[in-house]
């Protein structure tokens, strides 16, 4: 063991040391005094340090704890929130454009539809919103609620347009006809399919998001124990109170000590990893039906499709309603029935499609990425912290809590802080009730993500195939064959290049087809941050 | 005293290279994210680039992405902007800037509170 | 061209209040802080204000930042002919995952 450095006769420097910390010097002792009262700078021999000096210590120590802790946390927490405010925004810009490419379908190709089709339109795509802000609204009833108020306009506008006004009290009849007798085909039914999985799906990402924010909030702010702020000042403070004002602590004492104030943040770490994992399964599942961007996006072609199949079987469907509406109805009027030969060959057409270059699916692998270099965040905490405080490298001539040592010894640092005060004890008290709750909070959330109907390798191309999204052939069913058809094939490009997008909105004068596209451009996620800057020079 | 310092401006031709250095000291520098922000005679700024204070995570503006890359070590504290494929439009005072990040809630500021005092990069012919 | 809009000019006569706009979109003023930074003719950039309307030590009073959704704002009052300077706002975008700045306001004290 070196020879004690010779003591500091008159405090000064320990004097000048606290002054910063704490304005004016009557706590500070002008010589060396026995210190008998001291409760946790225990000392060997004449000590620079009163009570008030410990206590104020003690406070200083626990703040610096929390800000190391807030600035160990800051790069994710940005990352998180940036994030977050972007999907929420790009989702709301996806939502805008699906019902303003559904609008333009509607205005090119059925103008006479346009007056009510919006209203139904703007309604349905107002519940995709709600829906997908956590509101408690079906899906399915959504969808219902759309082709039960378009069938009736459909019918009275295109199928029976010299329909008197007289007779226009058949709407309700109309709208009960229209799940009767499937007047849209299996339309509806392939909507929902879409519709509420990707929203779903859409939903409980942001859900997820929104928690990884409430996670870091909470472990960002946790209030230390009066114990781990006498750990902390032993650690950072009590070598002053024998004028060694230079010596800095043993890295593994600070482990050591890190590991005690922690223990019940670092119970998060379990749950947090299976949060990440669970996150990187659903968006690696957030493709074709499970992707709100690809579904919503080309919705307007499915809805197309849907009134051309009643077009199509506009002459057997006036016949049945007019019986089945005839105490609203008088007569039949003049069918306005399409004939077969002014439909293009099923066989030909393909799916609109989102061309995902780099769009929101790009930018949800590349967060996953980033929070993937985040998986043992709070396992790592302790080792984080104890590197960004000053800590003695290679375990040598350090301050082991009691004395300056040539080298550290775990074993009988650990002695010296039993005698002090139980580390176990510390141990064993268990999280905080706040980690408690944001633990039960990620489990839950875990839970949700586990239980995800999401696709497993190939059977998601086996559903499709049930389910009718496949683009390129149709099935044996041809009149359920989805293609986009009238003013042929439109290809939808993405139109999420996000800067380009956030705040802006396309015109219903803009056709899908013939509006001008933005390029997507690479999206890089960003994660600056200030770690350590625990005495900021800003106010 | 809080200091940064640029270094390694000059004339260079089109499609040429230049390595802009910033040599820090005051302050811990391991501890700080760092940008590069420029600035056209004339002009208003524009950030360039920016690191992480590990040098693990780099980010750019599109105008730079694929020609120039940021760099730093920690151990001599000072930043490195490697600048290739340089064009005349890349003409600027180059400043090297201390960045801040706080976020409280679901709310967050990134500023730059250290600047130097700037290199110029002229890119001619 | 910017993604944050600032007027051109600004002026104003000694121990005038001034104010100088900022406009931006919800990716960045909309969901992140702003800050504003003084230059001075033939200098480096200085932060003025960061976090909306925080002061770093050796500011004087006198600048002052607020926000508004998407909008923010920078007021010097009892303006000075050293205050004679470009003014820059400046924030995080997270759609671009990159800062932004103002095209810089050049004021003007008569």
């Known amino acids: 063991q070196p020879p004690p450095p010779p003591p500091d006769a008159t405090c000064h420097q320990v004097r000048s040391f606290f002054q910063r910390l704490q304005p004016g010097l009557k706590w500070v002792p002008e010589t060396p005094v026995p210190g008998s009262d001291l409760q946790v700078c225990l000392p060997k021999g004449p000590t620079c340090c009163s009570r008030k000096m410990e206590e104020k210590y003690q406070l200083t120590a626990r703040l610096n704890m929390e800000q190391l802790l807030q600035s160990a946390s800051m790069e994710l927490k940005f990352l998180i929130i940036q994030n977050a405010a972007v999907f929420q925004e790009a989702f709301e810009i996806v939502v805008r454009h699906a019902k303003n490419y559904t609008n333009a379908m509607f205005k090119n190709n059925y103008p006479s539809l346009t007056p009510q089709a919006f209203e139904f339109v703007g309604e349905f795509f107002t519940d995709v919103s709600l829906y997908i802000l956590g509101s408690d609204i079906n899906v399915d009833d959504m969808v219902n609620e759309l082709f039960d108020s378009l069938f009736p306009v459909i019918y009275t506008q295109l199928m029976n347009p010299g329909l008197p006004d007289s007779a226009l009290d058949i709407n309700e009849c109309l709208r009960g006809a229209r799940r009767d007798l499937k007047v849209f085909g299996n339309f509806p039914k392939l909507i929902m399919t879409q519709v509420s999985k990707s929203l779903q799906v859409t939903r409980i990402f942001l859900q997820a998001l929104n928690l990884g924010i409430e996670v870091i909030n909470t472990t960002d702010h946790l209030k230390f124990s009066k114990d781990c702020g006498r750990m902390l000042t032993r650690m950072w403070y009590c070598s002053y109170c024998q004028g060694l004002m230079m010596v800095k602590p043993c890295g593994g004492y600070c482990n050591v000590v890190m590991q005690g104030c922690m223990a019940g943040v670092v119970e998060i770490d379990k749950y947090w990893r299976e949060y990440i994992l669970s996150l990187e399964e659903l968006v690696n599942g957030m493709y074709r039906i499970y992707d709100m961007e690809n579904v919503l996006l080309g919705l307007f072609s499915t809805i197309h499709d849907s009134i051309q199949y009643v077009q199509k079987n506009a002459g057997k469907l006036t016949t049945t309603i007019g019986k089945l509406c005839a105490h609203s109805q008088q007569r039949q009027y003049r069918s306005a029935y399409y004939p077969e030969d002014l439909f293009i060959d099923k066989k030909v057409l393909k799916v609109a499609h989102v061309e995902h270059e780099e769009t929101l699916s790009s930018r949800r692998r590349e967060l996953i990425q980033k929070l993937k270099s985040f998986i043992s965040f709070y396992s790592a905490l302790p080792g984080y912290i104890c590197s960004h405080s000053p800590v003695a490298e290679n375990d040598t001539l350090c301050w082991n809590g009691q004395e300056l040592v040539e080298r550290y010894s775990q074993k009988a640092a650990r002695n010296g802080m039993k005698n002090q005060f139980n580390l176990h004890e510390l141990k064993m008290k268990g999280p905080e009730p706040v980690v408690s709750q944001i633990i039960d909070k990620l489990k839950h959330i875990n839970q949700l993500l586990r239980t995800m109907s999401m696709p497993k390798g190939r059977v998601l191309d086996k559903n499709l195939d049930e389910e009718g999204f496949e683009s390129g052939d149709c099935g044996d069913d041809e009149d359920e064959c989805i293609g986009g058809s009238g003013d042929g094939m439109i290809k939808v490009k993405n139109q999420l290049r996000f800067l380009a997008e956030l705040a802006y909105d396309l015109d219903v004068d803009d056709a899908p087809g013939n509006s001008q596209q933005a390029t997507p451009k690479d999206n890089e996620i960003s994660t600056f941050h200030n770690l350590g800057n625990v005495h900021s020079p800003l106010k | 005293e809080v200091q940064l310092l640029e270094s390694g401006g000059g004339l260079v031709q089109p499609g040429g290279s230049l390595r802009l250095s910033c040599a820090a000291s005051g302050f811990t520098f391991s501890s700080y994210s760092m940008s590069w922000v420029r600035q056209a005679p004339g002009k208003g700024l524009e950030w360039v680039s920016g690191i992480s204070p590990s040098g693990g995570n780099k980010y750019y503006a599109d105008s730079v992405k694929g020609r120039f890359t940021i760099s730093r070590d920690n151990s001599k504290n000072t930043l490195y902007l490697q600048m290739n494929s340089l064009r005349a439009e890349d003409t600027a005072v180059y400043y090297c800037?201390?960045?801040?990040?706080?976020?409280?809630?679901?709310?967050?500021?990134?500023?730059?509170?250290?600047w130097g005092q700037g290199t110029l990069v002229t890119v001619s012919s | 061209q910017s993604v944050l809009t600032q007027p051109p000019s600004a002026s104003g006569t000694p121990g005038q209040r001034v104010t100088i706009s900022c406009t931006g979109s919800?990716?960045?003023?909309?969901?992140?802080?702003v800050n504003w930074y003084q230059q001075l003719p033939g200098t480096a950039p200085k932060l003025l204000i960061y976090a909306d309307s925080k002061r770093p030590s050796g500011v004087p009073d006198r600048f002052s930042g607020s926000k508004s959704g998407t909008s923010a704002s920078l007021a010097i009052s009892g303006l000075r002919s050293e205050d004679e300077a470009d003014y820059y706002c400046?924030?995080?975008?997270?759609?671009?995952?990159?800062?932004?700045f103002g095209g810089g306001t050049k004021l003007t004290v008569l």
């Open positions: 400046g924030s995080w975008d997270s759609s671009l995952s990159g800062y932004v």
């Open positions: 800037a201390r960045a801040l990040l706080g976020c409280k809630s679901a709310y967050c500021y990134y500023a730059m509170d250290v």
């Open positions: 919800s990716s960045n003023i909309g969901s992140n802080a």
